[in-house]
Interface confidence: low
């Protein structure tokens, strides 16, 4: 804590300007009025204060606003934001997207810090849901943000927000998360025509059920192998050879390279070998001709 000392004669700050960089820490404490600092926060960023001097300025704001800073101050914190602790941020009530953007900009290019995570949490909780504009902003700064949320948290994402999601935002999502996001995406894009719909829905297909994959196979979509490999195994298994051939289009050749990997491996085991042979890819491991494929969950009860 900086010791309380009287401000030397003639040094009282009339405004926040570059002359203050020559003040010692105790002079800043004594000569800068906290209320003046609060009203001229937007100037602080343009002045090359040292870290020690920024500590003094933060201390003054903390004294002025012990219950938490008002948004008018928060929006102009700039690099002073990096001095804040998660405990400081929990006292804030941030409602403006512009404020959020301004603070995320300060941390741009770095991993999501505990401060940023706390800020986002406060902001989203304040809004009640992850609306499109918020999601747009957050994924622009942190592409992996969406996949850092639990399935429960994702359930609060309204379908309209899905338009803000880019393919790279879903790179690290696991199947449980895609199970939640896929129905929302399907709803969001339901009025698009076939080709445009596939472009949009493709990244979410890791959550798609079998019936939706069957429908897509009728629409000349030409799914790439990387997308196919991310589909749910249980959704792929019931697909016929003809349906997979239509689904993949020119990419069907890639099945050969993936025949040892899921879901292709498990799918091959469920197909009749003579059906697989029609692909001309040399896929092996199907059910030998003459065998019956049983689904024991559907066998008839013995009388």
């Amino acid at each position: 804590e900086v010791e309380k000392t009287a401000c030397p004669s003639g040094k009282k700050a009339r405004e926040i300007d570059e002359s203050l960089i020559f003040y010692k820490k105790w002079e800043l404490e004594a000569c800068v009025d906290a209320a003046l600092l609060a009203t001229q926060m937007d100037r602080v960023n343009a002045i090359p204060f040292t870290y020690e001097q920024l500590d003094v300025l933060k201390h003054k704001l903390d004294e002025l606003y012990p219950q938490g800073y008002p948004e008018s101050v928060i929006q102009h914190l700039g690099y002073l934001f990096l001095k804040m602790s998660p405990e400081d941020i929990r006292k804030w009530n941030v409602t403006s997207l512009e404020t959020l953007k301004a603070l995320l900009e300060v941390n741009k290019g770095h991993e999501m810090s505990p401060q940023v995570a706390t800020l986002i949490d406060r902001f989203v909780k304040g809004r009640g849901q992850l609306d499109k504009d918020t999601l747009d902003t957050l994924t622009a700064f942190y592409p992996g943000y969406l996949c850092s949320l639990s399935p429960e948290e994702l359930s609060s994402v309204p379908p309209s927000s899905i338009w803000a999601v880019r393919p790279q935002d879903l790179d690290t999502c696991d199947p449980r998360q895609l199970d939640v996001l896929y129905p929302k995406a399907r709803l969001a894009f339901q009025n698009m025509n076939g080709s445009e719909y596939f472009v949009k829905i493709q990244s979410f297909l890791g959550g798609a059920p079998t019936e939706d994959l069957k429908a897509l196979s009728q629409q000349n979509v030409s799914m790439d192998l990387a997308t196919f490999m991310k589909l749910r195994t249980d959704a792929v298994l019931p697909l016929t050879v003809a349906e997979v051939q239509k689904l993949l289009g020119p990419h069907v050749e890639g099945l050969k390279a993936e025949e040892r990997h899921r879901p292709v491996r498990d799918w091959i085991l469920r197909q009749r070998q003579d059906d697989l042979d029609t692909l001309g890819l040399g896929l092996q491991g199907g059910i030998p001709n003459g065998y019956l494929v049983l689904d024991l969950s559907m066998q008839e009860a013995l009388s």
Epitope: P167, Q168, D171, S195, N220, V221, S222, D224, L225, A226, T227, M229, G249, P250, H251, E253, G254, K256, A257, E258
Partner: antibody, heavy 115, light 109 residues
């Protein structure tokens, strides 16, 4: 932003080999096939082949099967095309391409084969 | 190997609709040929426009559309703009490989 950054122009002698690189950024590298295309002096295009960066599986245009070899280095998100036993016929601009008409093209690498 | 043929040159005016076509020597072009369309501007600047017959690539203006017309693949520009003046190539899939057409030089006067 998706970008495909290719290596610079090459001037090589007949009979030698060359390796062109294509560094991908802005998307998951293993999630998309990488194609290679040749643009000759008459400005027409020829498809050389494509590689699945996830598995390394390759489809070649039969006309280039003995001329080109496609590889990838997943750790650096880079695709490579080697061209062998070069002749003046191989002088052209070569492109790496993600998804042909549905995607993104590199800026091209000019290869000049001359003694 | 199949030969893919395009108009060598077409001329249109700003605001007009123009259609470029792509023919296969092996017969009618179908959805199984997955027609792709690519634009080339000066200095080797290529941009993907259409994939899988009619799937517009991300960021491509809505005035570009792909279809099948008769036995050919087609690229239609509805309301051509001066900046659409370029070379346009189609590519067709023949089961194991792609073949490009010779390209159409589009002039927008």
């Amino acid at each position: 932003e998706v970008q495909l950054q290719q290596s610079g122009p090459e001037l090589v002698k007949p009979g030698t080999s060359v390796k062109i690189s294509c560094k991908a950024s802005g998307y998951p590298f293993t999630g998309h096939y990488m194609h290679w295309v040749k643009q000759g002096h008459v400005k027409s295009l020829e498809w050389i082949g494509r590689i699945n960066p996830y598995t390394g599986a390759i489809n070649y245009n039969q006309n280039f099967k003995d001329k080109a070899s496609l590889t990838v280095e997943k750790s650096s998100s880079t695709a490579y095309m080697g061209l062998h036993s070069l002749t003046s016929e191989d002088s052209a601009v070569y492109y790496c391409v993600r998804d042909l008409g549905g995607g993104y093209w590199g800026q091209g690498t000019t290869l000049t084969v001359s003694s | 190997q199949a030969v893919v043929t395009q108009e060598s040159a077409l001329t249109t005016s700003p605001g007009e609709t123009v259609t470029l076509t792509c023919r296969s020597s092996t017969g009618a072009v179908t959805t199984s040929n997955y027609a792709n369309w690519v634009q080339e501007k000066p200095d080797h600047l290529f941009t993907g426009l259409i994939a899988g017959t009619n799937n517009r690539a991300p960021g491509v203006p809505a005035r570009f559309s792909g279809s099948l017309i008769g036995d050919k693949a087609a690229l239609t520009i509805t309301g051509a703009q001066p900046e659409d003046e370029a070379m346009f190539f189609c590519a067709l899939w023949f089961g194991s490989h792609w073949v490009f057409g010779g390209g159409t030089k589009l002039t927008v006067l």
